[in-house]
Interface confidence: low
């Protein structure tokens, strides 16, 4: 009997390991898809940009390294902000490093001052985990400083030099990001 229980437990553990592996594969696949989509989008932009207009970023976008950023002049709720970025062939800003955060906050200070700007960060309703739009988790130093008390869905935004959280249905400016075009020589 004990042997039987032990065998079942081992089988269950094996099944669990397989499921975890599958989940890990899925997460990796999802991330890779998001990256591929960005590269594909950059490739399409490259192909479509004419020889006359080979600047790395469109008009009114700011460049930093291989990214272009658009700081909106109009506000909307988080979901609509994401839609608006998608229409421009971009996504809501995903902050990958402290260097990128410093560039963004420095640029905002010059452009507009201390307003709120949606970024592509939202909180999973079930687990409470913060996730970027490509499914990845922000690095520990880039987690929103305050947990919103809202019972509604919570999303991330940048204000001054902080990453904060708020009800996704509130109105804010937003920042879109896309890959900069490589200049064709």
């Amino acid at each position: 009997k004990l042997l039987q229980v032990s065998t079942i437990a081992m089988q269950q553990q094996e099944k669990l390991i397989q499921q975890e592996r599958a989940l890990l594969n899925f997460t990796e696949w999802k991330r890779s898809c998001a990256l591929q989509m960005k590269y594909c989008q950059a490739f399409m932009q490259n192909s479509l940009s004419s020889a006359h207009n080979s600047s790395p970023c469109p008009n009114n976008w700011i460049q930093n390294r291989e990214s272009c950023y658009y700081v909106s002049e109009i506000w909307s709720i988080w979901h609509t902000s994401q839609e608006n970025c998608l229409k421009e062939g971009s996504t809501l800003l995903q902050i990958e490093s402290k260097e990128e955060m410093d560039f963004i906050t420095g640029s905002l200070r010059k452009i507009k001052g201390s307003y709120d700007y949606w970024v592509g960060l939202s909180q999973d309703g079930h687990s409470g985990r913060w996730l970027w739009q490509d499914g990845s988790s922000p690095s520990p130093g880039l987690l929103p400083a305050e947990r919103s008390q809202s019972a509604n869905q919570v999303c991330g935004y940048v204000k001054s030099n902080s990453l904060l959280s708020s009800n996704c249905s509130t109105w804010k400016y937003f920042i879109c990001e896309k890959y900069a075009l490589r200049s064709s020589v």
Partner: nanobody, 120 residues
Framework: QVQLQESGGGLVQAGGSLRVSCAAS????????VGWWRQAPGKQREFVAA????????SYSNSAKGRFALSRDNAKNTVYLQMDSLKPEDTAVYYC?????????????WGQGTQVTVSS
């Protein structure tokens, strides 16, 4: 349902000023941006300026920035657009609207429109 009633349009010389008003009634406006869009003859309707009713934040289009000023009277539920340094290209029908997003053009309620003509 939100009802919007514009007034104050008219004919003005280039360089002149005009103030148009929009009185809103009906449903609560707290979920909306209320403001102005315009449509010039043969052109698409375009965003001019709007106020986020709950936060009071105001947005202007590039063409309106610096020349037009949006304000509101909470007690009267009325939005005003003060237009200065008017140019012939500002000639259009100006529509008051309540929108759930000004950028994506998701306008939920439109007014009837008021004609603004700027002569050179």
């Amino acid at each position: 349902q939100v009802q919007l009633q514009e007034s104050g349009g008219g004919l003005v010389q280039a360089g002149g000023s005009l103030r148009v008003s929009c009185a809103a009634s009906g449903r609560t406006l707290s979920n909306y941006a209320v403001g102005w869009w315009r449509q010039a003859p043969g052109k698409q309707r375009e965003f001019v300026a709007a106020i986020n009713w709950s936060s009071g934040g105001i947005s202007y289009s590039n063409s309106a920035k610096g020349r037009f000023a949006l304000s509101r009277d909470n007690a009267k539920n009325t939005v005003y657009l003060q237009m200065d340094s008017l140019k012939p290209e500002d000639t259009a029908v100006y529509y008051c609207a309540a929108a759930s997003s000004v950028l994506s053009g998701t306008v939920d309620y439109w007014g009837q429109g008021t004609q603004v003509t700027v002569s050179s």
